[in-house]
């Protein structure tokens, strides 16, 4: 099928376009180009007869068109009016006609745009600025760039007028940036020069430096003032309200006590018309003052807060010293000194950080000490402790329980029995108790400052008769010659006798056995493997005598020096070598072998069939007990002789 391709489709004014013909039929008589979408003699551009190779201009010919033998049409020096459709009329030799239509669009080559602004010096937080991209051009797209980045999303930025206008509402100093606009159409893209937005702002509250406010007589006072401002601020200094000078810096040499007072810096912005002032009080001491400590947190919470203690006053060229508990500062990662040593920071305070803290100022002759400061560290409550620790009481006695939890401020206490609130006191007293007073006794400690609460629950049984006791141990697998074991007979009860037996016998006399806690606790010091026996405790009161089930102590020991069997060390060639290693150990050890230092196998028995003199050497058995972390070994020399060379040799296994 006959088709027309426009190359390019979008044509810039002044450039050229080629209407390229595809699928031109064979055996042609001639062809003709027309402006528009149909064949119209009044709009013929050019005709071409193949036989004569003659091109004939038509009414629409402008002199800028060239026709090629392949029927393609080149139009040069394109103008805006050339936009539109073009029709090729082909006349075949059989005089049958065929038509095809193509088109192209003409766009102007865009000029370099520029930015116009409605406000060249907007005031921060007050004015809006509208940037407009010039010129206004039909069929052009407008884009904006801020610091060569596309526009950020902001409620203060608004595009309008087909994106040709960018408005910044309520400008801030941060809007001071490079702004560019760009125009685009299908044939060109042009970017403007950048426009820098000059936002007037400030002055902000001025800062006076240095920060120190205490000086010694005879020093020079050199104060500098700075306030963020555009245009830069104009500065004035006042001392005790009296104007001094219009400079950014104030210099007074060789000051005296009379130079003490309030020093005011005034910053003025002539464009915004705003003034801001800052006052600092300067104290000039005839000699170093007695220092004092200020704290940024008078009631820090344990494990939560940090506290910064600052030694006042701030004096230039002064050495600051600190003491805690009348000692120089300990080395601790939680203690940090500032560069000038004036501020001591305690990170993550604990209840042990209360102090007292003292700071000192060192002068030529002596050190002036501050008064001590004690930190009021809020902590707790810790888990409350209910005392006494008895869990069994006999009927008829008075039950008096006391609760205590470490806390600052002191905890407030509540008692609950079986979940029911009883009273808000530290002590709970019930007279003449019966078995009905058995139950769960809960003490709740509350710290009103931290808002934290902790509870402890104690089961109390009121019974004349004691239960069958049980033994608790602080170490279920003690290591020989290293660990101690404490057995405790439970429960703890008033007016109760505690007894102990080992393997059904009363306790032997031994310096390694110690009874404590009213005979309720039996401690074995430096346990040995011989202590691996059955331990039983008994309890007795007015109406009962009962024994616990036995607890067998599992003592971890060894490995002892291993023994290699058989003991033979000489073998005949051809015999089997079968060595077994054994070491006393609990738990059983792991075994491994080395021959002449070379690791072999991890077995208790080493077997080598038909040995030869090549098997001569040192055979080492290594034992290790993973539970005790101990190792041991033994080495045995084996000699293998050629058959029949020596009498009395072992025939092997």
């Amino acid at each position: 099928k006959l088709t027309i391709e426009s190359t390019p489709f979008n044509v810039a004014e002044g450039k050229e376009v080629l209407l390229l013909v595809h699928n031109l039929p064979q055996h042609l008589f001639g062809y003709s180009w027309y402006k528009g979408e149909r064949v119209d003699g009044n709009r013929q551009i050019i005709g071409y007869v193949i036989g004569t190779q003659q091109a004939t201009p038509g009414p629409a010919y402008s002199g800028r068109e060239i026709i090629y033998p392949n029927a393609s049409l080149l139009i040069q020096n394109i103008i805006q009016n050339d936009t539109g459709f073009y029709t090729l009329h082909v006349i075949k030799s059989d005089l049958v006609n065929e038509e095809a239509t193509g088109q192209f669009r003409v766009y102007p080559e865009l000029p370099k745009p520029s930015i116009s602004s409605n406000n060249s010096k907007p005031v921060e937080d007050k004015d809006a600025v509208a940037f407009t991209c010039e010129p206004e051009t039909q069929d052009a797209t407008y884009l904006w760039w801020v610091n060569n980045q596309s526009l950020p999303v902001s409620p203060r930025l608004q595009l309008s007028n087909g994106n040709r206008t960018l408005t910044l509402f309520n400008v801030t100093r941060n809007d001071t940036a490079s702004y560019k606009c760009e125009t685009q159409n299908p044939v060109s893209a042009r970017r403007s020069d950048s426009v820098i937005l000059n936002v007037l702002y400030g002055p902000d509250a001025p800062t006076i430096s240095p920060l120190n406010t205490s000086y010694r007589s005879g020093e020079n006072l050199n104060l500098s003032c700075h306030a963020a401002s555009n245009p830069p601020a104009q500065y004035s200094w006042f001392v005790n309200g009296t104007f001094q000078q219009s400079t950014q810096e104030l210099f007074i040499p060789n000051i005296t006590v009379n130079n003490s007072g309030s020093y005011t810096c005034q910053a003025h912005n002539s464009d915004t018309g705003l003034n801001r002032t800052t006052v600092t009080t300067i104290t000039v001491y005839a000699e170093p003052p007695k220092p004092f400590i200020t704290s940024n947190n008078s009631n820090p919470v344990e494990d939560e807060d940090a506290v910064a203690l600052t030694c006042e006053p701030e004096i230039q060229n002064t050495t600051y010293l600190w003491w805690v508990n009348n000692q120089s500062l300990p080395v601790s990662p939680r203690l940090q000194l500032s560069n000038d040593n004036r501020t001591l920071t305690l990170l993550s305070v604990t209840r042990n950080d209360v102090g007292p803290y003292e700071c000192g100022i060192q002068n030529e002759l002596s050190v002036d000490h501050s008064d001590p400061v004690i930190l009021n560290v809020l902590y707790g409550p810790d888990d409350p402790t209910i005392s006494p620790s008895y869990t069994y009481y006999r009927p008829g006695v008075n039950l008096s329980l006391s609760c205590h939890a470490a806390s600052n401020p002191p905890a407030q206490y509540s008692w609950l029995i079986d979940g029911n609130i009883q009273q808000h006191t530290q002590e709970l007293f019930i007279s003449n108790i019966t078995e009905k007073n058995s139950g769960l006794y809960t003490c709740q400690a509350n710290n009103s400052a931290s808002g934290h609460s902790r509870t402890t629950v104690k089961t109390i049984t009121v019974s004349a008769e004691l239960p069958k006791p049980s033994i608790s141990s602080n170490n279920s697998k003690p290591v020989e010659d290293k660990d101690a074991v404490a057995f405790t007979c439970e429960p703890e009860a008033q007016n109760t006798t505690y007894l102990w037996w080992v393997n059904g016998q009363s306790l032997p006399v031994s310096p390694r056995l110690q009874l404590s806690n009213g005979n309720r606790t039996l401690t074995l010091f430096n346990v040995t493997r011989n202590d691996a026996r059955a331990y039983v405790c008994g309890i007795q009161n007015s109406v009962s005598a009962n024994r616990s089930d036995p607890v067998t102590l599992d003592v971890l020991y060894g490995p002892d020096t291993p023994i290699i069997s058989p003991p033979d060390s000489s073998y005949l060639s051809g015999a089997n070598l079968n060595l077994s290693c054994h070491s006393a150990s609990n738990p059983s050890p792991q075994y491994s072998w080395r021959i002449n230092g070379i690791p072999q196998q991890h077995t208790q028995v080493l077997f080598i069939a038909k040995i030869t003199p090549n098997n001569n050497g040192t055979y080492a058995c290594f034992v290790s007990n993973l539970a005790t972390g101990r190792n041991n070994s033994i080495v045995k020399s084996i000699t293998v002789s050629a058959s029949g060379t020596s009498p009395g040799l072992s025939a092997g296994a």
């Epitope: 009927p395 004349a464 007795q540 009962s544 009962n546």
Partner: antibody, heavy 120, light 106 residues
Framework: EVQLQQSGAELVRSGASVKLSCTAS????????MHWVKQRPEQGLEWIAW????????EYAPKFRGKATLTADSSSNTAYLHLSSLTSEDTAVYYC?????????????WGQGTSVAVSS | QIVLTQSPAIMSASPGEKVTITCSAS?????MHWFQQKPGTSPKLWIY???NLASGVPARFSGSGSGTSYSLTISRMEAEDAATYYC?????????FGAGTKLEIK
């Protein structure tokens, strides 16, 4: 060997008092609680009280408060039951008994009993 | 006070017969203890802490129970077992005994 030896039978007049003794051997009464039990003729057992001879602490059944008083003398290894204002209701055999560990075993030892007869 | 009710009050059993004596408590108790008494002699601790046999007591005796319900059982009655058996609670004061069960041999 642990033994509790009680004093002999008593025949007393109504309204009078009587003091029964229980002497221990084979153990120290200071180390244990001594109980007293009453058994009326052809009747069951009634617990009267116990005493801790080491400190004199006592615990009485409400029924016997004011009627029975327990004491002990560690020097003679003896416990005593004092019965006052006797009536025919007090006619009974009175036993002392102790619950102790004899070696590894918890043992309950009883005296042979003292018979008290109250006559009008 | 806790009242212990023993049943039956009196019973007789043939040699080799299984015997069960029960003891019911008016309130829950920790353990129950049993005593044997033969005429003209002091009571003897027979079973302590519900199920433990006192020294010298034959293995045909056993004890069980919890809370308010306990029992003493003789697997095979023998003539020497004829006696009065008392249960006792020591959980709360006053300590109390059951009224006793008189066991006779047929």
């Amino acid at each position: 060997e642990v033994q509790l030896q009680q004093s002999g039978a008593e025949l007393v007049r109504s309204g009078a008092s009587v003091k029964l003794s229980c002497t221990a051997s084979g153990f120290n009464i200071k180390d244990n609680y001594m109980h007293w039990v009453k058994q009326r003729p052809e009747q069951g057992l009634e617990w009267i009280a116990w005493i801790d001879p080491e400190n004199g602490d006592t615990e009485y059944a409400p029924k016997f408060r004011g009627k029975a008083t327990l004491t002990a003398d560690s020097s003679s290894n003896t416990a005593y039951l004092h019965l006052s204002s006797l009536t025919s209701e007090d006619t009974a055999v009175y036993y002392c008994h102790v619950l102790i560990y004899a070696g590894y075993l918890a043992m309950d030892y009883w005296g042979q009993g003292t018979s008290v007869a109250v006559s009008s | 006070q806790i009242v212990l009710t023993q049943s039956p009050a009196i019973m007789s059993a043939s040699p080799g017969e299984k015997v069960t004596i029960t003891c019911s408590a008016s309130s829950s108790v920790t353990y129950m203890h049993w005593f044997q008494q033969k005429p003209g002699t002091s009571p003897k601790l027979w079973i302590y802490s519900t199920s433990n046999l006192a020294s010298g007591v034959p293995a045909r005796f056993s004890g069980s129970g919890s809370g308010t319900s306990y029992s003493l059982t003789i697997s095979r009655m023998e003539a020497e077992d004829a006696a009065t058996y008392y249960c006792q609670q020591r959980s709360t004061y006053p300590l109390t005994f059951g009224a006793g069960t008189k066991l006779e041999i047929k």
